[in-house]
Amino acid sequence: MMTGTIETTGNISAEKGGSIILQCHLSSTTAQVTQVNWEQQDQLLAICNADLGWHISPSFKDRVAPGPGLGLTLQSLTVNDTGEYFCIYHTYPDGTYTGRIFLEVLESSVAEHGARFQIP
């Protein structure tokens, strides 16, 4: 029986050109997490695998950073980034848990800001 639950950052907004942290947290299960996938609609953004570490999809390499933790940071946001994002936890023996986040990228300066990065 799948007893776990996923808590997400829910519906969030961010400013165009800024950055945002997407986070999911799996709790209430002793199942072993083997992989976490981050997807935007049907596009794979990133994977964190127990044995292989992080893999960022080539098309998002310049704008996606892993972390903090198992979260994902989106940078240089555009209005086209508005939409649904999914965290998919692969666990053993429970199976798959999925969390949903809706991101709205705003033109105004009312939105939240994510983490700041230094890129060499």
């Epitope: 799996l26 709790s27 002793t30 964190c48 292989l52 570490g53 972390g67 933790g69 230094q118």
Partner: antibody
Framework: QVQLQQPGSELVRPGASVKLSCKAS????????MHWVKQRHGQGLEWIGN????????NYDEKFKNKGTLTVDTSSSTAYMHLSSLTSEDSAVYYC??????????WGQGTTLTVSS | DIVLTQSPATLSVTPGDSVSLSCRAS??????LHWFQQKSHESPRLLIN???QSISGIPSRFRGSGSGTDFTLIINSLETEDFGMYFC?????????FGGGTKLEIK
Amino acid sequence: QVQLQQPGSELVRPGASVKLSCKASGYTFTSYWMHWVKQRHGQGLEWIGNIFPGSGITNYDEKFKNKGTLTVDTSSSTAYMHLSSLTSEDSAVYYCAREGLYAFDYWGQGTTLTVSS
Amino acid sequence: DIVLTQSPATLSVTPGDSVSLSCRASQSIRNSLHWFQQKSHESPRLLINYASQSISGIPSRFRGSGSGTDFTLIINSLETEDFGMYFCQQSNSWPYTFGGGTKLEIK
């Protein structure tokens, strides 16, 4: 198997700088965060910062922003921390630690840095 | 920055006892809390990740629980090899932070 190799000790003069190394093996270096942690004698652990070798992205604790600089050499799978303007307060054990799906799952043995004239 | 407060600072116990170590966060960190053991002159060792996830190779007497701001590490039937320092650490947001530690010593 995963290994993070650090020199055992470094002795430097006050005011000088030092570059501590952490050589990784047994895994894909560019796919995991590398963190640096400070521990003064018999005290707690302090997070200095991290670097993602795949992109060079870094994060620092504000306290260490003007003290340490993190870099990597992906060709040799080595992470470095450059510490400048050293004082006796910088004398400590410095650890590197890998973070993946299972948090800080592997640690180096630590480098004991002694700042003394 | 998120501050992690560990209590007690020191715990004197007898082998065979069971103990609870506490770690409290200054704000919610969901379940992004990890526990480490450190023995004298050794590197820290990961015991529990994400509040309650067991780690391969770590004895089952180590158990973690909690979410949000309050977390507990329970060690059942203490063995002599369990004495040392225990630290909690959060990875909910940068900068990552550690608790001040709990020293587990033999009574």
